[in-house]
């Protein structure tokens, strides 16, 4: 009764398509599948960026994946193939593994990479992202721009760039048609006569940094003797209005009466009748239902009541 | 099995020139960079330079003017011309790959002696 | 220039001791590349622990490495008979790359 033994894939390799992180991960089928034309191999992949604690495990029955990385740090893969149960009579085989690395070769001193890159999606519609130059870089360093997500051809260069003395330090954005909800891939590269630069690399998801306008139309209403209702309208835009989260803060007479945060463009106040002055600012953000992450707005205008009468039913700025 | 061996040194006197190799194998240096580090005798270490894989280089400011480094990729070997040499420029001079923004794997060093 | 700063300068120890070397940069280092390397006479220097905290292959796990910003650390929890020799820090984050000055471990 032989053993029945399976060799690993061949040709296991990481190819870059010039995605700035998008890779991929193909291979070959094993030598000597003959005795198994009846079953249907299944391969186990493991892969991470070089420094992670976890490997992400995928099975198979292709002979490609791909998936995005971190090209500021190494890529590391295994591969093995995997014989079901059904093929072998009994338990399942699985083959020793391929390995295979990945990793651009850098170039310049860490220092010379961009510093503070930041980037930010207003209102859902404009990305904006800028950076520092790196440290004790020249004035003829300049920074270049790339970025690619899936949908486009290939990786294009930012032709709207911010500058400061001459230099590259931000990249204002066309219109991304079908952007979010997928990683945006972005390297960040220079040049110089003097010294070798290297290149950064980052990866977001563009619905995690969008930063929305301010609320518009505050107005008071008075719902009873002692309850006040503040409104106020979502920012004109493609933001829909279940996307939102908002925080008030509300003073009566100067002092900070109350800072809260609701779902839906309303706040009912309960007040006293000795309120001679009650004013809010309200300010929003994209919520856990449309994104993972957000930056807050700035705060709206103030809206402000003063007098004695609290009556009336709107009060506008 | 990754190695470098370094060659080319010797007793030159101030003001002469030497050129050091540092011959790699097991590793391409199409594909990772390779550093000159120094040590005076009984002293700390210095870094020199670096070759990048990609062919640019780094340079320690203070001895950019007197010493330059270069490459041959179909040899696989790194060199470091040494000019207008100074009594303090004597040291074992070292080449090691760079790795990961790491230096992992060091020659055994060649010592250049700088004296009349 | 950044300057690595490590201290002590030499130390003496017997085996089983507990060592700890520091080494203090003169401008914030990012502890991704803050690395040291051990030397014995005669021999080329080698990766001992790089990444602040990662200890290179073949490296004992007596051997530790901790810090941020302008402070690290070398520790050896028991100091083995094999350990005698000196350790560099290095920080290889601005230009010029520079290492400390070294501490020698000797036997007491």
């Known amino acids: 009764d032989t053993e029945i033994k399976v060799n690993p894939p061949q040709d296991f390799e990481i190819v870059d398509p010039g995605y700035l992180g998008y890779l991929y991960l193909q291979w070959q089928p094993p030598l000597s599948l003959d005795h198994f034309k009846e079953c249907t191999v299944e391969y186990e992949l493991k892969y991470r960026n070089i420094g992670s604690e976890t490997w992400k495990t995928i099975i198979t029955k292709n002979l490609h994946y791909k998936d995005g990385f971190d090209l500021n740090k190494g890529i590391e893969a295994k591969i093995h193939t995997l014989l079901p149960w059904q093929c072998t009579n009994g338990s399942e085989v699985q083959s020793s593994w391929a390995e295979t690395t990945y990793w651009i070769s850098p170039q310049g001193i860490p220092e010379t990479k961009v510093q503070d890159m930041d980037c930010v999606y207003y209102n859902w519609q404009y990305l904006l992202c800028s950076w520092k130059p790196g440290i004790g870089v020249l004035l003829d360093t300049n920074y270049n721009l790339f970025y690619w997500y899936e949908g486009l051809d290939h990786a294009l260069q930012c032709v709207d760039y911010i500058k400061a003395d001459g230099q590259n330090i931000g990249c204002r954005f066309p219109y991304l048609e079908a952007s979010d909800y997928k990683d945006f891939y972005i390297c960040v590269n220079g040049s110089s006569e003097n010294k070798p630069i290297r290149s950064s690399y980052f990866t977001f998801q563009l619905q995690n940094i969008v930063k929305p306008l301010p609320p518009v139309y505050l107005t008071f209403t008075r719902e009873s003797s002692c309850e006040i209702k503040l409104k106020w309208s979502i920012p004109l835009g493609p933001i829909p209005a279940r996307c939102f989260d908002y925080e008030i803060e509300i003073r009566e007479d100067d002092t900070t009466l109350v800072t809260a945060t609701v779902e839906n463009e309303t706040y009912t106040l309960k007040t006293t009748n000795e309120t001679r002055q009650l004013c809010f600012v309200v300010r929003s953000k994209v919520n856990i239902y449309c994104s993972d992450d957000g930056i807050w707005s700035e705060w709206s205008d103030k809206q402000c009541w003063e007098g004695e009468d609290l009556s009336k039913k709107t009060l506008l700025r | 099995e990754v190695q470098l061996v370094e060659s080319g040194g010797g007793l030159v006197q101030p003001g002469g020139s030497l050129r050091l190799s540092c011959a790699a194998s097991g590793f391409s240096l199409t594909k990772y960079g390779v550093h000159w580090v120094r040590q005076a005798p009984g002293k700390g270490l210095e870094w020199v330079g670096v070759k990048w894989a990609g062919g640019s280089t780094d340079y320690n400011s203070a001895l950019m003017s007197r010493f330059t480094i270069s490459k041959d990729n179909a040899k696989n070997s790194l060199y470091l011309q040494m000019n207008s040499l100074r009594a303090e420029d004597t040291a074992v001079y070292y080449c090691?790959?760079?790795?990961?923004?790491?230096?992992?794997?060091w020659g055994q060093g060649t010592l250049v002696t700088v004296s009349s | 220039d950044i300057q690595m700063t490590q201290s002590p300068s030499s130390l003496s120890a017997s085996v089983g001791d507990r060592v700890t070397i520091t080494c203090t940069a003169s401008l914030s280092v990012s502890s991704t590349y803050l690395h040291w390397y051990q030397q014995k006479p005669g021999s080329s220097p080698k990766l001992w622990i790089y990444?602040?905290?990662n200890l290179a292959s073949g490296v004992p796990s007596r051997f530790s490495g901790s810090g941020s910003g302008t402070s690290y650390t070398l520790t050896i929890s028991s100091l083995q008979p094999e350990d005698f020799a000196t350790y560099y820090c290095h920080q290889y984050h601005r230009s010029p790359l520079t290492f400390g000055g070294g501490t020698k471990v000797e036997i007491k």
């Open positions: 990444s602040t905290s």
């Open positions: 090691a790959r760079d790795h990961r923004d790491a230096m992992d794997y």
